[in-house]
């Protein structure tokens, strides 16, 4: 929060905070998972690490009607500089390879934890 003239006004969220909040959300999803996440829906896998936030969003945006990952979708959109809509396909995806949403979220969490430890917040 930026304090100006006695009033607290929300400033831009530091990238480190945004990444930490995304990690916390993914931890919540993986820990609170009881039934198969998103009814066992499958999403495109990713085969590279550059441009990963947009690629991850492009995969997850195609999962509809799954409230458990809606917040993750919104948070990922904050990391992706362009608008992502369902049906988009990045060169980062493995076109013939789909994995379960639960595994995708779990792997995304692993990768983001590594980025956080390495100080790569953008």
């Amino acid at each position: 929060l930026t304090c100006l003239g006695g009033f607290a006004s929300p400033g831009p969220v530091p990238p480190s905070t945004a990444l930490r909040e995304l990690i916390e959300e993914l931890v919540n999803i993986t820990q609170n998972q009881k039934a198969p996440l998103c009814n066992g829906s499958m999403v495109w896998s990713i085969n590279l690490t550059a441009g990963m936030y947009c690629a991850a969003l492009e995969s997850l945006i195609n999962v509809s009607g799954c409230s458990a990952i809606e917040k993750t979708q919104r948070m990922l959109s904050g990391f992706c500089p362009h608008k992502v809509s369902a049906g988009q396909f990045s060169s980062l995806h493995v076109r013939d390879t789909k994995i379960e949403v639960a595994q995708f979220v779990k792997d995304l969490l692993l990768h983001l934890k590594k980025l956080f430890r390495e100080g790569q917040f953008n």
């Epitope: 085969n47 590279l48 690490t49 994995i99 379960e100 595994q103 792997d107 995304l108 692993l110 990768h111």
Partner: nanobody, 118 residues
Framework: GVQLLESGGGLVQPGGSLRLSCAAS????????MGWVRQAPGKGLEWVSR????????YYADSVKGRFTISRDNSKNTLYLQMNSLRAEDTAVYYC???????????WGQGTLVTVSS
Amino acid sequence: GVQLLESGGGLVQPGGSLRLSCAASGFIFAWYDMGWVRQAPGKGLEWVSRIGAHGNVTYYADSVKGRFTISRDNSKNTLYLQMNSLRAEDTAVYYCATAEDEPGYDYWGQGTLVTVSS
């Protein structure tokens, strides 16, 4: 689900070469550190080699340094182990495995047998 499928094992003479492959599926291979573990007959498990997710960090057991080379192709979801100057003591079942310290990210293949014998 997650699958790691090794191939390339077999019988080779001392001094010979083999290239092991590990095809990964069901998870985001490009984000995982990976490695090769072996188990010689009647012995325990031994880490042979590890490679970082980006392929830029590698580790080798002293027993294989200078002879084995680990590599990966993230576009093909495949891990490799090039084994040169093979010795009888390299005879073992070689397993492809994830090499993450984080709990819950432990995945192993079924193994491929390498026999070095004349």
